[in-house]
């Protein structure tokens, strides 16, 4: 069978080979399409409801004024010339519709390096057959499930027109130190060959590089955190971040009911002050970050104090942002 590709809504003429150019003609067309249950026979006499869909022209060709999805299928013509020689024509008709230019919607203006980000959603409406959407970074195709790239796809079919709407959501994890202004685009590739891809306008989000948090330092005076009864201990929380975060204090894992301050003074130390202390710096952009823990202890006269405070666990570390 000869393959014929026709655009939806356009007229289509199929030649009946070997048919006399004008009546009288001995020919018949047989159709097996989405409109027929089995084979439908059409003759030059025509007439009836089929004339609006397909009719035989005076020269024996079959004319479809506006091809639709239901016209996909097999078309056969059997003709006999004046000498009684029989000729058969066989066509396989496929239809297509090129959608409008695809678009990127819900596009991100900023991405964060090192974490997955939604870049945007590519939408193509009105294609047949469905076709495919693919994403590009600086003109080169992005491959899902490679190098921090993931794609969520959805295909819907219009209940009346039968045309397809495709959606593709792109997630990427930009590398640290990469291009600060990557250029993303999306393209629609038709399901039928010989038609070039349609590409969206590009988008160019900024990539924000989160500054790695420097550690919160807890300095103890006297060094080691061991002090005689009635002595004074000064705990200082040093945070290099700007602007200065709020500093709260913890004792034995419980927040102390004190106003925020980078310095905690424990005057006239008594047994009740012994324990493990840490400070928590709360950044507006990064969330809370806890220092190492230090142990404050009382030494009786004549005892050797430890040269350094015993260090507890690493605390909360940096809490991930939701």
């Amino acid at each position: 069978a000869q393959n014929i590709t026709a655009r939806i809504g356009e007229p289509l003429v199929l030649k009946c080979k070997g048919a006399p150019k004008k009546p009288p003609q001995r020919l018949e067309w047989k159709l097996n399409t989405g409109r027929t249950e089995a084979w439908k026979v059409l003759s030059p006499q025509g007439g009836g409801p089929w004339d609006s869909v397909a009719r035989v022209l005076p020269n024996g060709s079959l004319f479809l004024p506006a091809v639709g999805i239901q016209d996909e299928g097999i078309f056969r013509c059997q003709a006999m010339n004046r000498n009684g020689k029989e000729t058969k024509s066989n066509y396989r008709v496929r239809v297509y519709q090129i959608p409008g230019k695809p678009e990127i919607v819900d596009s991100a203006s900023e991405l964060t390096a090192g974490v997955p980000n939604k870049v945007g959603t590519c939408v193509s409406e009105g294609s047949y057959p469905a076709g495919t959407l693919s994403w590009h970074l600086d003109g080169k195709p992005l491959v899902p499930n490679e190098k921090g790239v993931s794609v969520k796809e959805q295909t819907r079919r219009h209940p009346e027109t039968g045309l397809f709407t495709l959606q593709s959501e792109l997630m990427v994890t930009p590398a640290r130190g990469g291009d600060p202004r990557p250029t993303f685009s999306c393209s629609f590739s038709p399901g039928l060959p010989r038609h070039r891809a349609l590409r969206t306008a590009p988008i160019q989000p900024r990539v924000w590089e989160p500054v790695p948090l420097e550690e919160v330092q807890l300095v103890v005076e006297p060094e080691g955190g061991a002090v005689a009864p009635g002595g004074t201990v000064t705990l200082t929380c040093e945070v290099p971040a700007q602007p200065s975060p709020q500093i709260h204090w913890m004792k034995d894992g419980v927040p102390l009911p004190l106003p925020p301050s980078p310095v905690l003074i424990l005057p006239e130390i008594g047994p009740q002050d012994q324990g493990t202390y840490s400070c928590v710096a709360t950044h507006s952009s990064h969330g809370p970050q806890e220092s190492r823990a230090v142990s404050i202890s009382i030494i009786e006269p004549g005892e050797e104090g430890p040269t350094a405070g015993s260090v507890g666990g690493s605390g909360l570390g940096t809490l991930a942002l939701a």
């Epitope: 230019k101 491959v143 685009s185 070039r196 306008a201 590009p202 988008i203």
Partner: antibody, heavy 118, light 113 residues
Framework: QVQLQQSGPELVKPGASVRISCKAS????????IHWVKQRPGQGLEWIGW????????KYNEKFKGKATLTADKSSSTAYMQLSSLTSEDSAVYFC???????????WGQGTSVTVSS | DIVMSQSPSSLAVSVGEKVTMSCKSS????????????LAWYQQKPGQSLKLLIY???TRESGVPDRFAGSGSGTDFTLTISSVKAEDLAVYYC?????????FGGGTKLEIK
């Protein structure tokens, strides 16, 4: 047929600015990138950057950031390149070219000669 | 930046001869995901603009005579003119569009003996 028509030659003084135009015809201006390329005698070809007229997104060669500014006017299907703080190093022929990700720089303007001299 | 090197810088041939010119890149121009080489060849005739001859390293632009052929992959590329004509007198440039900034080779000047 596709055509890119560039503005005429420019003679400018050091320190001044110049704006070169590139008028597109024969295709949908907003669907293709316009790239700009510099050619100095004996220095070969240097890529300056691109603009996508559909949404006026740009990409520059780091070397030309601050030197070249790319703009586009959809209504007249014209792309522009402004060159600022000109020195003798900027004396060159500047080309605009239509670019398609699938076909590279498939159509070029005829070039605009810029001479920087006091 | 990707450095593009062309050789020879010039060559003189007689009409009808076969010509090959080389273009090497400092890093691969082959993108593994689609197995395409992001390399183009351009022709610049004296006093004229540039004309695209080849893209994807080996695909001939429509309207370009079939005596022009591009080949190669990765970092080594070749432009071949199977039978030179007098009108082929020009400078031929290769260009990578694999990564920013896009870069061009220094050109090969073809002269006719």
């Amino acid at each position: 047929q596709v055509q890119l028509q560039q503005s005429g030659p420019e003679l400018v003084k050091p320190g001044a600015s110049v704006r070169i135009s590139c008028k597109a015809s024969g295709y949908t201006f907003t669907d293709y990138y316009i790239h700009w390329v510099k050619q100095r005698p004996g220095q070969g070809l240097e890529w300056i950057g691109w603009i996508y007229p559909g949404n006026v997104i740009t990409k520059y060669n780091e070397k030309f950031k601050g030197k070249a500014t790319l703009t586009a006017d959809k209504s007249s299907s014209t792309a522009y390149m402004q060159l600022s703080s000109l020195t003798s190093e900027d004396s060159a022929v500047y080309f605009c070219a239509r670019y398609d990700y699938d076909y590279a720089m498939d159509y070029w303007g005829q070039g605009t000669s810029v001479t920087v001299s006091s | 930046d990707i450095v593009m090197s062309q050789s020879p810088s010039s060559l003189a041939v007689s009409v009808g001869e076969k010509v090959t010119m080389s273009c090497k890149s400092s890093q691969t121009l082959l993108y593994s995901s689609n197995q395409k080489n992001y390399l183009a060849w351009y022709q610049q005739k004296p006093g004229q603009s540039l004309k695209l001859l080849i893209y994807w390293a080996s695909t001939r632009e429509s309207g370009v005579p079939d005596r022009f052929a591009g080949s190669g992959s990765g970092t080594d590329f070749t432009l071949t003119i199977s039978s030179v004509k007098a009108e082929d007198l020009a400078v031929y440039y290769c260009q990578q569009y694999f990564g920013y900034p896009y870069t061009f080779g220094g050109g090969t000047k073809l002269e006719i003996k």
